[in-house]
């Protein structure tokens, strides 16, 4: 007999997801309308292309990047799409309620879709730490809590620290990483006997993960420049991100070879490290004045990423129960911090140059922002982890971790799980 969802989840998931979707439809009906202002079509298309780049990054890039498990590749890709679709809907509403609602209705523009896609991307980064250990009903909870936490964090940072869209969205890297790691810490950790093979990577899924990495690599400049205010800022951000990711690819491949006793290249190292430069320059991508600086940051990020991929998985596996190939959590936590530190260093250099106490105050504000992002990520992550442990969600048994057959119908398989 083929494997099935546990009976209760079969009843719980469709009911939970469809009720939620119906609630979202009602909220959209009562509280939103499209931006009806006249725009020229050419401008609209150009604006839409940025949003399209972000959607490609999310659906294909992050979807496939997490698909390297031998027996969990289908679930990785499809669950990512499910979370993206749900996350974007909730993020549009939440951002609207937090920023526009006093005026009566939430106006939906291409920019709000762009923002929402970036918010949903946060969930796709975080979920890498827990994919394979949770079912879709649990992922719905994770999407709702994380998008809500990130939206509120961004609003608080915007209001208290007076930062622009770009600066407060660039906390997404550390936020998503620490959120995911804290959720993983709450979930049952030990992989029981007999499941060791399931969290290993296989050739074809690893190839699709590499495809995901390539999509992310191609579109990372769009991500880092999407929320910047003027053409000069965007152009600079695109250039610097491109130089940084280009160098981090070279560093990743050569560093991976260097880290192996026989000089072999690790797929896992490469998957993660090719993106390192883009994450590291994220916060400061528009501020870096020359290519060589972006390239140096890409080099440093690539080395940190390879070093992290070599030494951290053992620790993450023991403490958090994160499999070796789930590299995004610790990778983004390190590189996101590096990016934030780079921005703070730029402010410190300003202080040294100007000898000005007020710029020193800006340094403190930036440290405060970063600390707040980490604290909210950890707290909301722990809350989510505790919620996901509730019996109501009928989480997969540990023996069925990292297994597509728990969730998918495979007609060609005669024998069940």
């Amino acid at each position: 007999m083929s494997s099935k969802y546990p009976r209760s989840v079969r009843r719980c998931l469709p009911l939970w997801a469809l009720t939620l979707e119906a609630a979202l439809i009602l909220l959209f009906y009562f509280f939103t309308h499209y931006d009806a202002s006249l725009e020229d079509q050419k401008g609209l298309v150009a604006s839409y292309q940025v949003g399209q780049d972000l959607t490609v990054m999310a659906a294909i890039g992050l979807g496939f990047l997490t698909s390297s498990f031998r027996r969990h590749s289908w679930s990785s890709v499809a669950f990512n799409l499910f979370m993206l679709a749900l996350g974007v809907q909730w993020a549009i509403l939440l951002d609207g309620f937090l920023s526009q609602f006093p005026s009566g209705k939430v106006v939906i523009t291409l920019f709000s879709i762009r923002l929402a896609t970036m918010s949903a991307l946060s969930v796709l980064i975080s979920v890498d730490a827990v994919l394979g250990k949770v079912n879709l009903a649990q992922l719905v909870v994770m999407v709702l809590v994380e998008v809500t936490a990130l939206g509120n964090l961004r609003m608080v940072i915007s209001n208290i620290f007076n930062t622009d869209y770009h600066m407060n969205m660039m906390h997404i890297y550390v936020f998503a990483a620490y959120f995911g790691l804290s959720v993983a810490w709450c979930l049952p950790k030990p992989l029981p006997e007999g499941t060791e093979d399931k969290d290993q990577t296989a050739t074809i899924p690893s190839l699709s993960a590499m495809l995901g990495a390539l999509f992310l690599w191609m579109f990372w400049p769009s991500f880092n420049s999407a929320l910047l205010r003027s053409p000069i800022e965007r152009k600079n951000a695109v250039f610097n991100t491109y130089y940084a990711v280009a160098v981090s690819v070279v560093t990743a491949i050569s560093g991976s070879s260097l880290a192996h006793p026989q000089g072999k290249i690790s797929k896992t190292y490469v998957h993660s490290a090719v993106l390192a430069g883009g994450v590291a320059v994220g916060t400061s991508c528009h501020l870096i004045p020359s290519p060589w600086l972006a390239m140096v940051l890409g080099l440093v990020a690539g080395l940190i990423s390879v070093g992290g991929a070599k030494y951290l998985p053992g620790c993450c596996n023991r403490v958090l129960g994160i499999p070796h190939s789930s590299i995004m959590g610790y990778n983004f936590s390190l590189l996101g911090l590096l990016g934030e530190i780079i921005y703070i260093v730029l402010l410190v250099l300003d202080t040294v140059g100007a000898g000005n106490g007020m710029i020193g105050f800006q340094v403190l504000l930036s440290i405060g922002e970063l600390s707040l992002a980490i604290v909210i990520a950890l707290m909301s992550g722990l809350l989510t982890g505790l919620l996901l442990n509730l019996k109501i969600w009928k989480a997969p048994h540990e023996a069925k971790y990292f297994d597509d057959q728990v969730f998918w119908k495979f007609p060609h398989l005669a024998v069940g799980f």
């Epitope: 523009t109 003027s230 004045p289 250099l349 105050f361």
Partner: antibody
Framework: QVQLVESGGGVVQPGRSLRLSCAAS????????MHWVRQAPGKGLEWVAG????????YYADSVKGRFTISRDNSRNTMYLQMNSLRAEDTAVYYC??????????????????????WGQGTTVTVSS | EIVLTQSPGSLSLSPGERATLSCRAS???????LAWYQQKPGQAPRLLIY???SRATGIPDRFSGSGSGTDFTLTISRLEPEDFAVYYC?????????FGQGTKVEIR
């Protein structure tokens, strides 16, 4: 020459609507953010709304949020302000202004600056019953 | 939301004198987003100083700006007859253009 020309002002009753236009010439309109600023009789300048160079993002002052809509048509080199549910306190001279962006650099970072470097002569909106 | 407070509200000076106008922000702001404008009766405002010490095109060197954090200053070293006008400071962060309430410089 480089200029901004506002039009569409006039006398209107409270609760009614009005649409202002700002025609730009002499520069690449699609490369600049644009703004509406108003000045009530005998009062100071008040920023009303702004729109990014590509039209993707719009900002409003709290006093007009939900009533006014800023938009632009880069193919026509024109910016608009649709004003609905007008109130007596919306009576003012409305200026359109171009957002100039630039930067200076040190060896390690860029410093961006933004200001309104080009203004129209203004169009008067009077809301009165 | 950032609030800009200009002082004094008005200033009575004679031509040739030095004018010092102050602008205080309710919280620390990036100095590169601060600008000063001059407005004469019946005319549109004109950009004077930005970022906070660069002069706009065509602005004479008797106008200078300084400051950082929360305190900014516009200085007119020697007032000329055409300088008597209302001066506004503006913060232009986050694409929102907050103005101060203005300082009127009038002939004594």
């Amino acid at each position: 020459q480089v200029q901004l020309v506002e039009s569409g002002g006039g006398v209107v009753q409270p609760g009614r609507s009005l649409r202002l236009s700002c025609a730009a010439s002499g520069f690449t309109f699609s490369s600049y953010g644009m703004h509406w600023v108003r000045q009530a009789p005998g009062k100071g300048l008040e920023w009303v709304a702004g729109i990014w160079y590509d039209g993707s993002n719009k900002y409003y002052a709290d006093s007009v949020k939900g009533r006014f809509t800023i938009s632009r048509d880069n193919s026509r080199n024109t910016m608009y302000l649709q004003m609905n549910s007008l109130r007596a306190e919306d009576t003012a001279v409305y200026y359109c202004a171009r957002e100039q962006g630039g930067y200076s650099s040190s060896w390690y970072r860029r410093y961006y600056y933004y200001n309104m470097d080009l203004w129209g002569q203004g169009t008067t909106v009077t809301v009165s019953s | 939301e950032i609030v800009l407070t200009q002082s004094p509200g008005s200033l009575s000076l004679s031509p040739g004198e030095r004018a010092t106008l102050s602008c205080r922000a309710s919280q620390s702001v990036s100095s590169s987003y601060l600008a000063w404008y001059q407005q004469k009766p019946g005319q549109a405002p004109r950009l004077l100083i930005y970022g906070p010490s660069s002069r706009a095109t065509g602005i004479p060197d008797r106008f200078s700006g300084s400051g950082s954090g929360t305190d900014f200053t516009l200085t007119i070293s020697r007032l000329e007859p055409e300088d008597f006008a209302v001066y506004y400071c503006q913060h232009f962060g986050n694409s929102r253009g907050t103005f101060g309430q203005g300082t009127k410089v009038e002939i004594r």
